[in-house]
C-alpha cells in the first residue's frame, strides 16, 4: 500500500504523459487522478513506466473500479495487463474481440500465463461458444490453444469454426480431443470434393472411425505414414490388407519401418499372413494359414 501524502505544489498531473516516469511512487499516488488515468489509459502503453509505477497505477484503477474495470479501460491496459492477477481478471466482462486481441498482443511471443488463460476463459464463456473469429485469434497467438481444452470444452466448438483450424493447431491434441473434433470437421468439410476434402480432414483423422477410413480407402487418397500412425488403433484393426493398401497408396511401403509400432503392430497381428505377403514388404506376425480366428467380442455381444 502506498501512503496517502499530499501532492507537492506544481506536480498535479494535468494529463498522462512521459513526465510521470520521473515521479516517485508516492508522487504518482498523490498527483495522478484515477479518473484522469481511466480516460487516458491508451497513453500508458506508450510511456516506459517501471513495474513499480505500474503497480501504483493499477492500485488507483482498483480503487476507482472495485467491482472490476469497464471494457473501455481494459482495452487500453497494455503493459498494465502484466500486473493483473487471475482474480482481477475474473471480475471483468470482456465481450469485444478487439479487446481480447489487444491484451493477447501484450503477451505475444510468450507462453500462455494463468492470466491469459483466465482472460480467454472469461471471453469464451461470455460468448457462449468458441466461434470462428475467436478461434482464429486464439490459434494465431497460441497454436496449441485448441489442444489445451478438455473434450467437454471442445464440444462447444461449432463446426463452422473448424475452418479456422490449421494442422499445427492439432499437434498436441490427444485421441479424446480428436474424437470430439473429427465429427465437427467431417460436418464442416462435407461439401468438398474428394482430394480437397482429404487435405482438410487429414489433421483430424486421429478421431475417425473404421467406416470412415474404409470410405477413404476407396478414394485414392494416398495417406502418408505419419497420418496413419496417428489413427485410432481400434479404427485401424478391422481394416483389411487391401483397404490399407488402397488407403496408403504408394506410402504402403512405409509399413515395414513401422511394423513394431502401434497401430501397425496390432493391425499386423489381426491379418492373415497370406494377405500380408501379397504386399511384398516382408511383414511378419500375421495369422498363419489354416488358423481360424474367433472374434470373442462379437460372440459376447450376441449372448
Amino acid at each position: 500500500e502506498v501512503e496517502k501524502t499530499a501532492c507537492p505544489s506544481g506536480k498535479k498531473a494535468r494529463e498522462i504523459d512521459e513526465s510521470l516516469i520521473f515521479y516517485k511512487k508516492w508522487e504518482l499516488e498523490a498527483c495522478v487522478d484515477a479518473a484522469l488515468l481511466a480516460t487516458q489509459m491508451d497513453r500508458v502503453n506508450a510511456i516506459p513506466f517501471t513495474y513499480e509505477q505500474l503497480d501504483v497505477l493499477k492500485h488507483k484503477l482498483d480503487e476507482l473500479y472495485p467491482q472490476g474495470y469497464p471494457e473501455s479501460v481494459i482495452q487500453h491496459l497494455g503493459y498494465l495487463f502484466l500486473k493483473m492477477s487471475p482474480e482481477d481478471i475474473r471480475k471483468w466482462n470482456v465481450t469485444s474481440l478487439e479487446t481480447l486481441k489487444a491484451l493477447l498482443e501484450v503477451n505475444k511471443g510468450h507462453e500462455m500465463s494463468p492470466q491469459v488463460a483466465t482472460l480467454i476463459d472469461r471471453f469464451v464463456k461470455g460468448r457462449g461458444q468458441l466461434d470462428k473469429d475467436t478461434l482464429d485469434t486464439l490459434t494465431a497467438f497460441y497454436p496449441g490453444y485448441l489442444c489445451s481444452l478438455s473434450p467437454e470444452e471442445l464440444s462447444s466448438v461449432p463446426p463452422s469454426s473448424i475452418w479456422a483450424v490449421r494442422p499445427q493447431d492439432l499437434d498436441t491434441c490427444d485421441p479424446r480431443q480428436l474424437d470430439v473434433l473429427y465429427p465437427k470437421a467431417r460436418l464442416a468439410f462435407q461439401n468438398m470434393n474428394g482430394s480437397e476434402y482429404f487435405v482438410k480432414i487429414q489433421s483430424f483423422l486421429g478421431g475417425a472411425p473404421t467406416e470412415d477410413l474404409k470410405a477413404l480407402s476407396q478414394q485414392n487418397v494416398s495417406m502418408d505414414l505419419a497420418t496413419f500412425m496417428k489413427l485410432r488403433t481400434d479404427a485401424v484393426l478391422p481394416l483389411t490388407v487391401a483397404e490399407v493398401q488402397k488407403l496408403l497408396g504408394p506410402h504402403v511401403e512405409g509399413l515395414k519401418a513401422e511394423e513394431r509400432h502401434r497401430p501397425v503392430r496390432d493391425w499386423i497381428l489381426r491379418q492373415r499372413q497370406d494377405d500380408l505377403d501379397t504386399l511384398g514388404l516382408g511383414l511378419q506376425g500375421g495369422i498363419p494359414n489354416g488358423y481360424l480366428v474367433l472374434d470373442l467380442s462379437m460372440q459376447e455381444a450376441l449372448s
Partner: nanobody
C-alpha cells in the same frame, strides 16, 4: 534472468565528459525498457534517463541537453550514457536497470559505477 554490469565511471573535472556502459547477459531478448539511475550519498535514488523498447529516450530535467542515453540491441553492451558538461552535483553511483516482459514483469539492477566530478 538478466545480469547487468556497469563500467566507465571515474573521476572527472567539472565541464568534462564520461561515457558509461552497461553490459547485459542472460535473457537479453526479453528486455523491455532500460534506465540509468543515480544515487548520491545520503540521497534517494533518482531516475536519470530511460530508453524504451522502441528506442525513445526520456531525460530528467537536471540532465536534459547534457546527457544522452542510447541502446544497442545488437551487442551485449546494451546501454550507454554519454555525460557531457559534468557538474559537481552529478557526483553519484550510476546504476543500470532493465525490466523484462512477462508475468510478473521483473526488474534487474547492476551494482553501479562511481562517477565523481571534482576539481
Amino acid at each position: 534472468q538478466v545480469q547487468l554490469v556497469e563500467s566507465g565511471g571515474g573521476l572527472v573535472q567539472p565541464g568534462g565528459s564520461l561515457r558509461l556502459s552497461c553490459a547485459a547477459s542472460g535473457s537479453i531478448s526479453s528486455i523491455r525498457h532500460m534506465r540509468w539511475y543515480r544515487q548520491a550519498p545520503g540521497k534517494q535514488r533518482e531516475l536519470v534517463a530511460t530508453v524504451s523498447n522502441d528506442g525513445s529516450a526520456y531525460y530528467a530535467g537536471s540532465v536534459k541537453g547534457r546527457f544522452t542515453i542510447s541502446r544497442d540491441n545488437s551487442k551485449n553492451t546494451l546501454l550507454y550514457l554519454q555525460m557531457n558538461s559534468l557538474r559537481a552535483e552529478d557526483t553519484a553511483v550510476y546504476i543500470c536497470n532493465a525490466d523484462t516482459w512477462g508475468w510478473p514483469g521483473a526488474d534487474y539492477w547492476g551494482q553501479g559505477t562511481q562517477v565523481t566530478v571534482s576539481s
